[in-house]
């Protein structure tokens, strides 16, 4: 008799794929035709592009009125006219819903100011946030984000209260908190009192970019958080290029999309947008490079392969890899909610298996080092339910030159510098 199927876990929409942060709507909008409309309307115009990335939610803003460091002139219920109108926002919500993209609103109060939470007027601000949650939930948003919560006194209790409001409205609404902290104990204390909170932090940005260290960070985090749902990013707001050299971007994309939890990216991560390559652009919010005319300040500074348009036409680009990974992440059961087992594969490597019941299984092998390595996959570390076969089919490599679909012998696996492999193999009874 065939073994009984394992019961599928209840999955919320944010469990099914990546979130995409657009912190600065004006920078995302770019130049040229994009400037024809207010940024919120312009964003509505980009929804088909965002659909092509298969992201499940957009984290927007903040877009509310905020006069720097002035709590009285900060209105979380009003959209700053520089971004558009409430009508534009309603229209964006409707259009996003039609495309099955959720909208999460960042309500970090003093986003233009020195301290995000007006440290001296915490109670006033907390009341404003409560009112804003209720107002925007009624307006139809799917969730909220608050950042820099290390600057919020009694953050845990406020987050619990805001979570109650959000979940009280609907279990299908999400609260994301962001912190600059990379300290696991601080992160765990924030998570302890908030069951469904999604937390973005700088935890992984501390990895020192070695395989062993990354493996130990990931496994420590997963062990410490038990069976709660995680999110994966390198920071609460910044681009991957703020932390990573170009040669590791593909590796990290592969990792973030295949770890158990929700991957969270910032606009431009899909193309390797790098403020350092754009003189005069702010590090935290460089202009999005839609095409070569997107950065007119210095003619010739932007080449086609740095842009969405150029990378869309190149199957070997970072954008094409992002799209493929996002697609796999959103449709394969083992990646959607499969178990995770990390195991030894040799120095400099991080490898793990994702598997769910009798579905196709995935093996990820990541070489963080700048030398080629032979992987010694130690299957003895794995439980019987996740044993390795002798061969697995190559689904994709982060480097060009490998024949996709070809079976690779796992005992003789060689990886190029900074190469990541995603392999698949069937369940065997």
């Amino acid at each position: 008799r065939a073994p009984r199927c394992r019961e599928l876990p209840a999955q919320k929409w944010w469990h099914t794929g990546a979130l995409y942060r657009i912190g600065d709507l004006q920078a995302f909008q770019g130049h040229g035709a994009g400037n024809l409309a207010a940024p919120i309307s312009g964003l509505k115009g980009r929804l088909d592009y965002l659909s092509s990335l298969k992201v499940k939610g957009l984290v927007l803003g903040p877009i509310h009125k905020n006069q720097k460091d002035d709590v009285a002139q900060t209105d979380l219920l009003q959209i700053d006219p520089n971004f558009g109108s409430k009508e534009d926002f309603d229209s964006l919500l409707q259009s996003a819903k039609k495309k099955s993209i959720r909208v999460i609103l960042d309500l970090t109060p003093n986003y233009r100011g020195e301290n995000s939470w007006f440290s001296t007027q915490v109670d006033t601000v907390a009341t404003k946030v409560k009112d804003a949650l209720e107002f925007w939930l009624q307006a139809g948003v799917d969730g909220f984000q608050v950042r820099d919560i290390e600057n919020l006194k009694d953050a845990s209790s406020f987050l619990a209260e805001w979570q109650n409001i959000t979940k009280g409205f609907s279990e299908d609404r999400l609260l994301i908190a962001g912190t600059n902290s990379s300290d696991l104990q601080q992160i765990l204390s924030l998570l302890e009192s908030n069951k469904d909170l999604l937390l973005t932090s700088s935890y992984l940005s501390d990895s020192g970019s070695t395989g062993e260290h990354t493996k130990s960070l990931v496994t420590q985090y997963l062990n410490a958080t038990g069976n709660r749902w995680c999110s994966w990013s390198l920071s609460q707001a910044r681009l991957l290029t703020s932390f990573l050299p170009a040669q590791l971007l593909r590796l990290y994309q592969l990792m973030l999309f295949t770890l158990p939890g929700t991957p969270v990216f910032s606009y431009g991560d899909e193309i390797g947008l790098d403020a350092a390559a754009l003189p005069g652009q702010p590090m935290e919010a460089p202009v999005m490079l839609w095409d070569e005319s997107s950065f007119p300040d210095i003619p010739g500074a932007v080449s086609a392969n740095m842009t969405v348009k150029g990378q869309s036409e190149d199957p070997g680009s970072l954008l094409s890899l992002f799209r493929r990974l996002s697609d796999q992440r959103s449709k394969e059961r083992s990646l959607l909610h499969g178990d995770f087992h990390a195991f030894s594969a040799g120095p400099g490597l991080f490898s793990y298996i994702r598997h769910w019941d009798q579905n196709e299984r995935f093996l990820v092998v990541l070489n963080f080092g700048d030398v080629g390595l032979s992987a010694g996959l130690q299957a003895s570390d794995l439980p019987a339910s996740a044993s390795l076969p002798a061969k697995a089919d190559l689904l994709l490599s982060t480097q060009p030159g490998r024949e996709e679909g070809s079976p690779l012998e796992l005992e003789r696996l060689k990886l190029e510098p900074h190469e990541g492999l995603l392999l698949r193999f069937p369940y065997a009874a």
């Epitope: 409309a37 207010a38 088909d48 109108s85 839609w290």
Partner: antibody
């Protein structure tokens, strides 16, 4: 509901100027762009240029550069198109249209014209 | 500038007929093509955008297809109110926005 209402017909002499208005209502004026499109008698449609009601940025068709000016007045939610040094081949119906943006797979922005004014006939004749 | 060429320039058809109008771009415009209908003395009306998306309120007998350089507008079963002039418009390489020269659809 969204409406664009244009000013009435004009008869002008060659060399003169004409200014056509387009009053918008039923939506947030500053959130969209306005394009101007003209149609000579019995002919097809010709795009003249656009203006962003959000920030006043303009872009004009090459052949009209230097003769056309597009402006907006956000207080009255009205767009204007002024054409100078009129010639007989400028005789046409002039339309304003709201520009809505959309994008595709490669992120390029397309523009569609979802609402149009009723048209203003400008006749240039000596 | 991208040139848009429509064919035929005019055609005659009867109520109930299936009609196809084509539009060719002088270079690839991906799916950045819109179709408009214009009746005499009236402003154009948007029918299809992004090559195949039906504008809200437009009857489902209208459909669009194509990408790259070749596009078609199809009316599955002509109704009396469909006799008009149809224009394609590209907005891939903007500015400038360019229109086709139009196709006049008349009653046979």
């Amino acid at each position: 509901q969204v409406q664009l209402v244009q000013s009435g017909a004009e008869v002008k002499k060659p060399g003169a100027s004409v200014k056509v208005s387009c009053k918008a209502s039923g939506y947030t004026f500053t959130s969209y762009g306005i394009s101007w499109v003209r149609q000579a008698p019995g002919q097809g449609l010709e795009w003249m240029g656009w203006i962003s009601a959000y920030n006043g940025n303009t872009n004009y068709a090459q052949k009209l550069q230097g003769r056309v000016t597009m402006t907006t007045d956000t207080s009255t939610t009205t767009a204007y198109m002024e054409l100078r040094s009129l010639r007989s081949d400028d005789t046409a119906v002039y339309y304003c249209a709201r520009g809505e943006l959309y994008s595709g797979y490669d992120g390029t922005l397309g523009i569609l014209f979802d609402y149009w004014g009723q048209g203003t006939l400008v006749t240039v004749s000596s | 500038d991208i040139q848009m060429t429509q064919s035929p320039s005019s055609l005659s058809a009867s109520v109930g007929d299936r009609v196809t109008i084509t539009c060719r771009a002088s270079q690839s415009i991906s799916s950045y093509l819109n179709w408009y209908q214009q009746k005499p003395g009236k402003a154009p009306k948007l029918l299809i955008y992004a090559a195949s998306s039906l504008q809200s309120g437009v009857p489902s007998r209208f459909s669009g297809s194509g990408s790259g350089t070749d596009f078609t507008l199809t009316i599955s079963s002509l109704q009396p109110e469909d006799f008009a002039t149809y224009y394609c418009q590209q907005s891939y390489s903007t500015p400038p926005i360019t229109f086709g020269q139009g196709t006049r659809l008349e009653i046979k």
